[in-house]
Interface confidence: low
């Protein structure tokens, strides 16, 4: 950066050179350069030469003023018209930030993704800081009372086999920059109240042509908890508003959960589960799309790898879309 | 300018107490927890623990949670840590410092308190 | 608690030569983001001075003469060239976890 230059002279900040966005500031510059009574002393903010607002303090400094100073980052340097020199002489340059001191970090959750082998905590930043801003996970054993801390610009992920205290914590999140420092609420939690089942996904959809024709959603899960409660949430693709089934769910076989649906329309399906009684859910699963078929299925054409066909009987989807906007990975 | 002011040398018998100070000037005293170090003559460093101002939340080295009591005092920026049944292994200079940014290293020191036990 | 094992002891040093100083880790101290290892230079009667954080970054205001590096267990400080100014005592320190704990120091000296 502009920092690493040499110097024949010096560059100040006042109140410093990270600030509260929207204060007045002032930048000294003072030469120092052998032979030279400076002129005129000029300032110049990424590159460009400023025009207004600077005072001559003496003979060797100068300052420059401004008020509501906005910009996140701002290189600066100095340079000094010296008698019987052509060109400026460059005094020093500094690098300057604003941005606002952190808010109390909110909304802390802290959640085991079964397999995962680690705890992810997350929570509300606040505002945006504009500056480096660090965040410090405390976690306080309730039974030993020995505290880790973890450092990390955003999110964490803590190994579950550092969590060696026992199974109730607090948790709490610090937030740092060179403005200010908050502390969240205590966040008290207990392990095996945090564990969200393997990621339910469904695999497939077949429509059967009875009486009233059926469609069978196939999904499954790898997880090994024994009591999981699921939601699979289905609408029309023309529908604003989703139609959720419950399910008490035990994934020791794959699941089949029967639709009666209108025919000929463009179905999308997702799913999630929790451990039963349990306070986190899964993040909703990739969007599934399926249409069904008009009252008397014509000819069925074949998606992806799917070899088990009622020929004429059946119409299957294997098909899964990208994340939209009502698809949102929330927990809660 | 971030200044670590500590109080001075202390002689104490074996069994007192002892209580250091350590007055902060130059940023905002409740925004940065306080860490206390410990030098004993000739050895390396100890981490005693820490305070952090707002709350009044500390945090001990297992070491030193029987015997070191860490406090504030927010209305002069000042930070104590007393130390009880005070023994000759006390003996040590004690160090307030402060990070930076939290956890990226004691950019600030106190000068130093020596404590010396002794009959 | 971590324990930071710090070699040599001491060590002397022909003025402009490369002076190396090793910290072990008893475990990780690291993640992708962040080696949670800082260096100290300490002179006699003054307060321990920082001089690398998280391993290799610099701390404002110290000679490019001092360098950090290393990941996960190992970790190392170069000085190079060594000064005259540069005789003191080095320390490694963790802030992996509570408690954060210091390496045993290496006494430089410059022949």
């Known amino acids: 950066g502009i920092t690493n230059i040499n110097c024949s002279g010096h560059i100040w900040v006042e109140p410093a050179t990270i600030f509260k966005m929207g204060m007045n500031i002032s930048i000294y510059c003072q030469a120092a350069i052998k032979n030279c009574q400076p002129r005129k002393l000029h300032f110049y903010k990424n590159g460009i030469k400023e025009r207004f607002q600077i005072t001559r303090i003496n003979k060797t400094t100068a300052r420059l003023w401004y008020k509501n100073f906005l910009e996140p980052h701002a290189s600066m340097y100095c340079t000094a018209e010296c008698p019987k020199h052509f060109q400026e002489t460059l005094i020093c340059g500094k690098d300057i930030s604003s941005g606002y001191p952190p808010d109390i970090p909110d909304e802390v959750t802290c959640v085991i993704y079964e397999y995962s082998g680690n705890m992810t905590c997350t929570w509300n930043a606040g505002k945006l800081t504009y500056i480096d801003t660090k965040y410090v996970v405390h976690v306080k054993s309730l039974e030993t009372e020995e505290e880790q801390q973890y450092l990390t610009s955003s999110y964490i992920n803590i190994s579950t086999d550092s969590l060696q205290g026992g199974k109730k914590y607090l948790v709490w999140v610090q937030a740092a920059n060179a403005l200010g420092m908050e502390e969240s609420k205590q966040l008290q939690i207990h392990l095996d109240d945090i564990v969200i089942p393997s990621a339910a996904v469904i695999s497939r959809a077949e429509t059967i042509n009875a009486t009233v024709p059926k469609t069978i959603i196939y999904w499954d899960s790898q997880t090994t908890i024994e009591k999981v409660s699921c939601e699979m949430r289905y609408k029309a693709t023309t529908n604003q508003t989703w139609n959720v089934k419950e399910f008490d769910t035990n994934f020791t076989y794959v699941q089949q959960s029967e639709f009666y649906l209108e025919p000929n329309i463009k179905y999308v399906f997702q799913v999630r589960c929790q451990e039963t009684g349990k306070r986190y859910w899964q993040p909703w699963s990739s969007l599934f799309f399926h249409k069904t078929p008009e009252t008397v299925p014509q000819v069925t054409s074949k998606a992806f790898q799917h070899d088990t066909w009622n020929s004429g009987l059946t119409v299957a989807s294997i098909s899964t879309g990208h994340l939209t906007s009502d698809n949102r990975g929330d927990i809660g | 300018e971030v200044q670590l002011q500590q109080s001075g040398p202390e002689l104490v018998k074996p069994g007192a107490s002892v209580k250091i100070s350590c007055k902060a000037s130059?940023?905002?005293?409740?925004?940065?927890?306080m860490d206390w170090v410990k030098q004993s003559h000739g050895k390396s460093l100890e981490w005693i623990g820490y305070?952090?101002?707002?709350?009044?939340?500390?945090a001990y080295s297992q070491k030193f949670k029987s015997e070191a009591t860490l406090t504030v005092d927010k209305s002069s920026s000042t930070a104590y840590m007393e130390f009880h049944s005070l023994t000759s292994e006390d003996s040590a200079v004690y160090y307030c410092?402060?990070?930076?940014?939290?956890?990226?290293?004691?950019?600030?020191w106190g000068q130093g308190t020596s404590v010396t036990v002794s009959s | 608690q971590i324990v930071l094992t710090q070699s040599p002891a001491s060590l002397a040093v022909s003025l402009g030569q490369r002076a190396t100083i090793s910290c072990r880790a008893s475990?990780?101290?690291?993640?992708?983001?962040?080696?949670?290892i800082h260096w100290y230079q300490q002179k006699p009667g003054q307060p321990p001075k920082l001089l690398i954080k998280?391993?290799?970054n610099l701390e404002s205001g110290v000679p490019a003469r001092f360098s950090g590096s290393g990941s996960g267990t190992d970790f190392t400080l170069n000085i190079h060239p060594v000064e005259e100014d540069d005789t003191a005592t080095y320390y490694c320190?963790?802030?992996?976890?509570?408690?954060?704990?210091f390496g045993s120091g290496t006494k430089l000296e410059i022949k």
């Open positions: 410092a402060r990070w930076g940014l939290r956890r990226d290293g004691f950019t600030y």
């Open positions: 130059g940023y905002t005293f409740t925004d940065h927890t």
């Open positions: 305070i952090y101002p707002k709350s009044g939340n500390a």
């Open positions: 475990q990780s101290v690291s993640t992708s983001s962040y080696n949670y």
């Open positions: 998280y391993a290799s």
């Open positions: 320190q963790h802030t992996w976890e509570i408690p954060y704990t």
